[in-house]
Interface confidence: medium
Amino acid sequence: YDFTNCDFEKIKAAYLSTISKDLITYMSGTKSTEFNNTVSCSNRPHCLTEIQSLTFNPTAGCASLAKEMFAMKTKAALAIWCPGYSETQINATQAMKKRRKRKVTTNKCLEQVSQLQGLWRRFNRPLLKQQ
């Protein structure tokens, strides 16, 4: 999906008001310094691409993020503020239902959510030069 035509300010507002809290709640008890940010993004569409990938695509050691509160709110924000996004997700959602696993918070998931926090921070600061 091409995120170029999303309403970035509306997505940012959704992040600042709710998604950020849910990410903090998920990471509660984990020091942010435990993980190095290895995933980066260069502009807002790129950031949303990376955020979608880390949030919804199962990875080795972390298959369960899509059912977390921050993920559901991220999905809702993208569906509302990115034209045509919902349609592209129908097949992906059906595939996910077939391989649903019980929620387990692993260290790998914590690391992944730490990366997500960094991507969201970058999304919110589009005028900053890339580090």
């Epitope: 008001s17 903090i24 509660s28 600061r125």
Partner: nanobody
Framework: EVQLVESGGGLVQPGGSLRLSCAAS??????????IGWFRQAPGKEREGVSC????????YYADSVKGRFTISRDNSKNTVYLQMNSLRPEDTAVYYC??????????????????WGQGTLVTVSS
């Protein structure tokens, strides 16, 4: 649940002082590299950033309008950030909010991104 609760506001005469507190629950300031800041919104005006403290190195930032009068500090053992406000002026009258997940050094204090999580605390400066 993740929450921020602001307190310490009230009615004070011009030239007086107040200390605002921002207490976090549901998460620990010290565990994150989020910066924490204070904002205010006066009746009929836009929200504006007042001050910010970096959770990485303790660096502090102030809006020009409060420099030399306000001091931001934090106490990680109490999970609280404070705003000491001295030499208060009528134009400081506003609802004061604190917020996390902001970025002290990006665009200047006045241009923070933020969304209030708490109800804020009202500061009224009047004789």
């Amino acid at each position: 649940e993740v929450q921020l609760v602001e307190s310490g506001g009230g009615l004070v005469q011009p030239g007086g002082s107040l200390r605002l507190s921002c207490a976090a629950s549901g998460f620990t300031f010290a565990d994150y590299d989020y910066d924490i800041g204070w904002f205010r919104q006066a009746p009929g005006k836009e929200r504006e950033g007042v001050s910010c403290i970096s959770n990485r190195d303790g660096s502090t930032y102030y809006a020009d309008s409060v420099k030399g009068r306000f001091t931001i500090s934090r106490d990680n053992s109490k999970n609280t950030v404070y705003l000491q406000m001295n030499s208060l002026r009528p134009e400081d009258t506003a609802v004061y909010y604190c917020a996390v997940e902001i970025h002290c050094d990006d665009y200047g204090v006045e241009n923070f991104d933020f969304d209030p999580w708490g109800q804020g605390t009202l500061v009224t400066v009047s004789s």
